[in-house]
Interface confidence: low
């Protein structure tokens, strides 16, 4: 709370406007108006997404109207920075107190249409963990007071399990909502169909998505694993590559193991399934390993989990960084 | 033309900004700054879509700095009015002349239902064929009688070449429109910016996309090529894999050669660039080859074309199906 012997400033950001056609100018000026305070030392700092900006500010000299002073500080931004949805804050320090105002590009008033997607369980969850889940994903929602409802049903009419819901605000200002439903392993394998219904006051009609076990021919994956040779300037790390191909259907889980321990998924990067020239699918998986790891045990395993693989729905291939040693 | 005996005013509209979440305030203030004129009578009028507004303007008293005067006039609008896409003009009459500035709500940077993308030239077209092109792609258009217009310009103001246009109806009923523009190799390398403007009767406003050479650090790709061993039941074909990694920027072209002849792009499948754990990117490329090919000449080349590769922007690696023979 400010003490009574000074009048604190009002901080307000104004911005240069778009032209008569609604087009953004090449540069955007933010003008921080610090007004109506008892004359005294003030310090103005600009922040970008909470970080102090190292900028050459064009701060106008302070003007005085009667007993109160005003100062303004201008920040010039490129159109690219402004359109990248960063938040800019004008932070004023005065008499040991901080006053601020923040701004960012106004959210689109007419955002892109809503899309809904319904996933199948991952083969890993289905066959290894034996606790399959399916996820209904709704993207590009405009944040609003209206609630998004995601409700589940089964084609058989049998009751569904309890689902868990998650909402996430994206950087672009839209809302992403997911609902994850545990499904019975046997129900799924026997071909049950699950439906996700999405309703929202701004949707003209409900969105319905359904998912079931993929039909059609089955083929087990072939798994090949390779290690890259040493490359100049990177003696202490190597890349391992795994090619998994000619499998059907396209649902597959890829894991890497070292020392009989499964490495975290974040360690590797696996491509989305793509069609081969024939009727199957393929993926690549890439893992970076360190000298410490291969010196501890020079055997890394690439494992594919797929419904057509036997035994026990897995196929794996071992690879070494230095196979000759 | 103004006579010499007075300095005319500069007219500029500033507006109140959206908050740190990008939300519009309940009311929007437009501030018309009329500055730097020789003191004299001025008249300020606000127009809405060209019509004089009957408003009670809060026009601040004129201030004088040295020999020049400044005046400001503020217009307060409801959020609804501002969001209805009307154009507001601050019109200043002074010494028998009219000076004005106009503004409206900034166009949505990504209007609903339609997305526009503007590609950079492929390194192959840029460095090998030396006939680079850029493509403006508009997707998710609702088919209608109204024409989608894609027009090109350059930041330098120089004329653009003749573009070619293609329309394609998608399975989901939407329309995809592309416009391909040949660009000068030297212009591109020297950093010219190209703009594609998309207009359509059903778009609330024009979409603008721009492209230019990627800035930032450069790193040449590492290229590794592998052949899969024989797999039961497929004696007469093999898969070749190429891992290209740690390159920057992400623009890359991948080719396969056999017998010193480049194989058609349709023969191989190459993933989109993905980030490595470090600062670079990686891709995988997959090629299926037949016994007839490897018996004719058992050497296949995976070639990467990338701006940081030297010499001549290419790095390649040879691989054989039967390396020992």
């Amino acid at each position: 709370v400010c003490s009574r012997d000074f009048t604190p400033p009002t901080v307000k950001i104004l911005q240069s406007s778009c032209d008569g056609g609604g087009h953004f100018p090449p540069t955007i000026q933010l003008l921080c108006l610090v007004s109506g305070y008892t004359p005294g030392t003030i310090n103005i700092t600009w922040l970008e997404d909470g970080q102090v900006m190292d900028v050459d500010l064009s701060t106008a000299s302070t003007t005085q109207e009667g007993e109160l002073a005003s100062t303004q500080s201008e920040l010039t931004l490129s159109q690219k920075h402004w359109l990248s949805d960063r938040t800019y804050t004008c932070q004023v320090t005065y008499q040991g107190h901080t006053f601020e105002d923040s701004t960012k590009k106004c959210a689109d008033s007419n955002p892109r249409g809503v899309s809904a997607y319904l996933s199948r369980p991952s083969p890993f969850d289905l066959f290894i963990r034996k606790s399959p889940t399916i996820t209904c994903l709704v993207v590009d929602l405009a944040p609003s007071k209206g609630t998004v409802n995601l409700t589940w049903s089964r084609a058989s009419g049998k009751p569904v399990n309890h689902s868990t819901r998650k909402e996430e605000k994206q950087r672009n200002g839209t809302l992403t909502v997911t609902s994850t439903l545990p499904v019975g392993t046997r129900d799924w394998i026997e071909g049950e169909t699950y439906q996700c219904r999405v309703t929202h006051p701004h949707l003209p009609r409900a969105l319905m998505r359904s998912t079931t076990k993929t039909s059609g021919p089955r083929a087990a994956p072939e798994v090949y694993a390779f290690a890259t040779p040493e490359w100049p300037g990177s003696r202490d790390k190597r890349t391992l590559a795994c090619l998994i191909q000619n499998f059907m259907p396209e649902d597959i889980s890829v894991q890497w193991l070292h020392n009989e321990v499964q490495l975290p998924d974040a360690r590797h990067s696996t491509t989305q399934p793509r069609k081969t020239k024939g009727s199957g699918f393929f993926v690549f998986s890439r893992l970076e390993v360190t000298r410490a790891e291969w010196e501890q045990k020079d055997e890394f395993i690439c494992r594919a989990v797929h419904e057509a693989a036997s035994p026990s729905q897995t196929v794996q291939r071992a690879v070494s960084v230095n196979p000759g040693k | 033309v103004c006579s010499r005996d007075f300095t005319p005013p500069t007219v500029k509209i500033l507006q109140s900004s959206c908050d740190g979440g990008g939300h519009f305030p309940p009311t929007i203030q437009l501030l018309c700054l009329v500055s730097g004129y020789t003191p004299g009578t001025i008249n300020i009028t606000w127009l809405e879509d060209g019509q004089v507004m009957d408003v009670d303007l809060s026009t601040a008293s004129t201030t004088q700095e040295g020999e020049l005067a400044s005046t400001q006039s503020e217009l307060t609008l409801s959020q609804k009015h501002w969001l209805s896409d009307r154009t507001y003009t601050c019109q200043v009459t002074y010494q028998g002349h009219t000076f004005e500035d106009s503004t409206k709500k900034c166009a949505d940077s990504n209007p609903r239902g339609v997305s526009a993308y503007l590609s950079r030239p492929s390194p192959f077209d840029l460095f090998i064929r030396k006939s680079p092109t850029i493509t403006c792609l508009v997707v998710d258009l609702a088919p209608s009688k109204g024409t989608v217009n894609l027009t090109w310009s350059r930041a330098s103001g120089k004329p653009v070449n003749h573009s070619t246009r293609k329309e394609e109806k998608q399975r989901n009923g939407t329309l995809t429109v592309t416009s391909t523009l040949p660009v000068g190799t030297r212009d591109w390398i020297e950093g010219e910016t190209y703009q594609c403007r998309v207009t359509h009767p059903h778009l609330p406003r024009a979409l603008m996309r721009s492209t230019t050479k990627t800035s930032g650090p450069r790193a040449a790709p590492e290229v590794y090529a592998f052949a899969t061993p024989e797999w039961p039941g497929s004696r007469d074909k093999r898969t070749l894999a190429c891992l290209i990694q740690n390159f920057m920027p992400e623009d890359i072209s991948v080719q396969w050669l056999h017998n010193e002849v480049q194989l058609p792009d349709a023969r191989h499948s190459t993933t989109q660039p993905r980030k490595t754990k470090g600062s670079g990117f990686f891709v995988f490329s997959r090629l299926e080859v037949t016994r007839a090919e490897w018996e004719q000449k058992d050497e296949f080349i995976c070639r990467a074309v990338h701006e940081a590769a030297s010499p001549s922007q290419t790095v390649q690696r040879a691989v054989s199906v039967n390396p020992g023979k």
Partner: antibody, heavy 121, light 111 residues
Framework: EVQLVESGGGLVQPGGSLRLSCAVS?????????WEWIRQAPGKGLEWVAS???????NYNPSVKGRITISRDDSKNTFYLQMNSLRAEDTAVYYC??????????????WGQGTLVTVSS | DIQLTQSPSSLSASVGDRVTITCRAS??????????MNWYQQKPGKAPKLLIE???YLRSGVPSRFSGSGSGTDFTLTISSLQPEDFATYYC?????????FGQGTKVEIK
């Protein structure tokens, strides 16, 4: 330019049946758009009746569902409205129309000249 | 179903007059900033003709004296300066939700 021409209207007794045709020229009904029937009782307003999408899917106004069937003959580039169990309140001018699609919504952009159906004993 | 109520049901006006017709929906016909309200003109013995789509977008070939505005549940069709060929019946229509519905019509007659 697309043109729509209705035919098949006339006088029919209550409980009777009638099939209206809409012949389309200048555009294939399987290429795109939604194709509509809309009616207008004498001196009254407009009422949307039924539609057939270029992909063959159909929609009906709940007020007529069960008595009315929309269909098409691709080889003749014609779509139809089969009306059964006709009542006096079905008396109207029946228009066929082509709807323009916009992200799951449609409006009636091109209309035929209309054909009069009178249900009376 | 969404009910649309037009007012007035009829009006008499002279050439050059400014005419305003309103249409009120029983629920909002807006979706993500798009207004799913259309306006049609019908002359005696003729099929309706689409004038305005999405609340305010003039169909090509429609004179600029016609304009549409509004959002949510309240929409307006305005003829800025009535011409002899504008005497007709005007209908609003919502395409936000199936079944698509029309207003009961507003007849614009010569005074």
């Amino acid at each position: 330019e697309v043109q729509l021409v209705e035919s098949g209207g006339g006088l029919v007794q209550p409980g009777g049946s009638l099939r209206l045709s809409c012949a389309v020229s200048g555009y294939s009904i399987t290429s795109g758009h939604r194709w509509e029937w809309i009616r207008q009782a004498p001196g009254k307003g407009l009422e949307w009746v039924a539609s057939i999408h270029y992909d063959g899917s159909t929609n009906y106004n709940p007020s007529v569902k069960g008595r009315i069937t929309i269909s098409r003959d691709d080889s003749k580039n014609t779509f139809y409205l089969q009306m059964n169990s006709l009542r006096a309140e079905d008396t109207a001018v029946y228009y066929c129309a082509r709807a323009t699609h916009y992200f799951g919504h449609h409006h009636f952009a091109v209309w035929g000249q209309g054909t009069l159906v009178t249900v009376s004993s | 179903d969404i009910q649309l109520t037009q007012s007035p049901s009829s009006l008499s006006a002279s050439v050059g007059d400014r005419v305003t017709i309103t249409c009120r929906a029983s629920q909002s016909v807006d979706y993500h900033g798009d207004h799913y309200m259309n306006w049609y003109q019908q002359k005696p013995g003729k099929a309706p003709k689409l004038l305005i789509e999405w609340g305010s977008y003039l169909r090509s070939g429609v004179p600029s004296r016609f304009s549409g505005s509004g959002s949510g549940t309240d929409f307006t069709l305005t003829i800025s300066s009535l011409q002899p060929e504008d005497f007709a019946t005007y209908y609003c229509q919502q395409n936000a939700e199936d079944p698509y519905t029309f207003g009961q019509g507003t007849k614009v007659e010569i005074k």
